[in-house]
């Protein structure tokens, strides 16, 4: 999705993206905050489809693990933080009910600020 | 998804999130860059499920529409930019082939920087 670096831009926070299979994921949190099991395969008209997700999170090895890039450090403390969004997935809850639920997955790395006190 | 403001934090970029139905969306871009029609409903074992998506984009009315919050303006130009991710959706392509494809949806608002030249 349109790389800022190609335009000579830098991200305030470094992120990494990867495809994650349901087999790797195993469980997730649904919209009600409950833990559900993510099924490996989804039945479709012509058989089964492997369930997987495109996830983006803050790069733990990146330059910005100590704070965000380009911040005015005199006035702000900063931190890169992974944010989540909701995607629909075929899941099973603790009562063994199988169904399509929205689950939380990592989708971005954003910068959060707190004002520096007592300068 | 865990609001930074509750912890006395501010986002470098202001975003807005909403649920978008396939009926509102109508079309999307798939992973190959082609335009596909997003189907309104998905067949499931007990009938049909309305297809919709959780989308997050930069807030055009927000404080950060002119640039990111908290940036060191002496050294950097900044811009809040909507980024996209991939989610699976039931779609139809221009050849009338219906299938599950990964489509791009807006999932975040991040800050990009460019170095200030000629100071």
């Amino acid at each position: 999705h349109s790389d800022p670096a190609r335009r000579g831009e830098l991200s305030v926070c470094d992120s990494i993206s990867e495809w994650v299979t349901a087999a790797d994921k195993k469980t997730a949190v649904d919209m009600s905050g409950g833990t559900v099991t993510v099924l490996e395969k989804v039945p479709v008209s012509k058989g089964q489809l492997k369930q997987y997700f495109y996830e983006t999170k803050c790069n733990p090895m990146g330059y910005t693990k100590e704070g965000c890039r380009g911040i005015d450090k005199r006035h702000w403390n900063s931190q890169c933080r992974t944010t989540q969004s909701y995607v629909r997935a075929l899941t099973m809850d603790s009562k063994k009910r199988i169904g399509w639920r929205f689950i939380r997955i990592d989708t971005s790395c954003v910068c959060t600020l707190t004002i520096k006190r007592g300068r | 998804h865990s609001d930074p403001a509750r912890r006395g934090e501010l986002s470098v970029c202001d975003s807005i999130s909403e649920w978008v139905t396939a009926a509102d969306k109508k079309t999307a871009v798939d992973m190959s860059g082609g335009t596909v029609t997003v189907l309104e409903k998905v067949p499931v074992s007990k009938g049909q499920l309305k297809q919709y998506f959780y989308e997050t984009k930069c807030n055009p009315m927000g404080y950060t529409k002119e640039g990111c919050r908290g940036i060191d303006k002496r050294h950097w130009n900044s811009q809040c930019r909507t980024t996209q991710s991939y989610v699976r959706a039931l779609t139809m392509d221009s050849k009338k082939r219906i299938g599950w494809r990964f489509i791009r949806i807006d999932t975040s608002c991040v800050c990009t920087l460019t170095i200030k030249r000629g100071r």
């Epitope: - | 109508k26 082609g34 335009t35 029609t37 189907l39 309104e40 409903k41 139809m92 221009s94 050849k95 009338k96 219906i98």
Partner: antibody, heavy 119, light 106 residues
Framework: DVQLVESGGGVVRPGESLRLSCAAS????????MSWVRQAPGEGLEWVSG????????YYADSVKGRFTISRDNSKNTLHLQMNSLRAEDTAIYYC????????????WGLGTLVTVSS | EIVLTQSPGTLSLSPGERAILNCRAS??????LAWYQQKPGQAPRLLIY???TRAAGIPARFRGSGSGTDFTLTISRLEPEDFAVYYC????????FGGGTKVEIK
Amino acid sequence: DVQLVESGGGVVRPGESLRLSCAASGFTFDNYDMSWVRQAPGEGLEWVSGIRESGDITYYADSVKGRFTISRDNSKNTLHLQMNSLRAEDTAIYYCARETRKAILFDYWGLGTLVTVSS
Amino acid sequence: EIVLTQSPGTLSLSPGERAILNCRASQNIDSDLAWYQQKPGQAPRLLIYGANTRAAGIPARFRGSGSGTDFTLTISRLEPEDFAVYYCQQYYDWPRFGGGTKVEIK
């Protein structure tokens, strides 16, 4: 003999709405996907919107997405195009056209109905 | 998006002559191209699809050829009723038409 007869055209002001209809005969209407194609005065052809045989899937050109809605009534062998928020550039002859089985190309056309958007 | 460019814009010929109309796509569209004929005050009529297959009832003097990005519609001997505007349309992606070629009497 296949016949497609459009109606509902007329003169409207920018921002107003209009509903076009197309009465089909001479073929099994609910076995065919249908489209609307338009032609601005003295200009070329532009595909506007299409709908699958059962009416459950609709598809649109970017220029009308969000403003126009295609629908069909298979019990009455009728195709419709609801046009909202009309603009001067929507002025055209609107043709109802039958799509071929496997692709969005058009084997039969009506004679068209003229829509004029002018203040 | 795929852009179709038709040439020439106008072709001035006499009945009995051969007409050669060109349609170029901005990217590969395999053989997903159709040709239509439109006479003044009439609806378009499908002539050719699949780049070279004649639609039902279309005379053999109309012949389509080409694949990939370059396509040609050839009318071997022009009849009086063939003077019209001709459009190409790609359906490799969502449908788009070329700007048209007018075949007029010289």
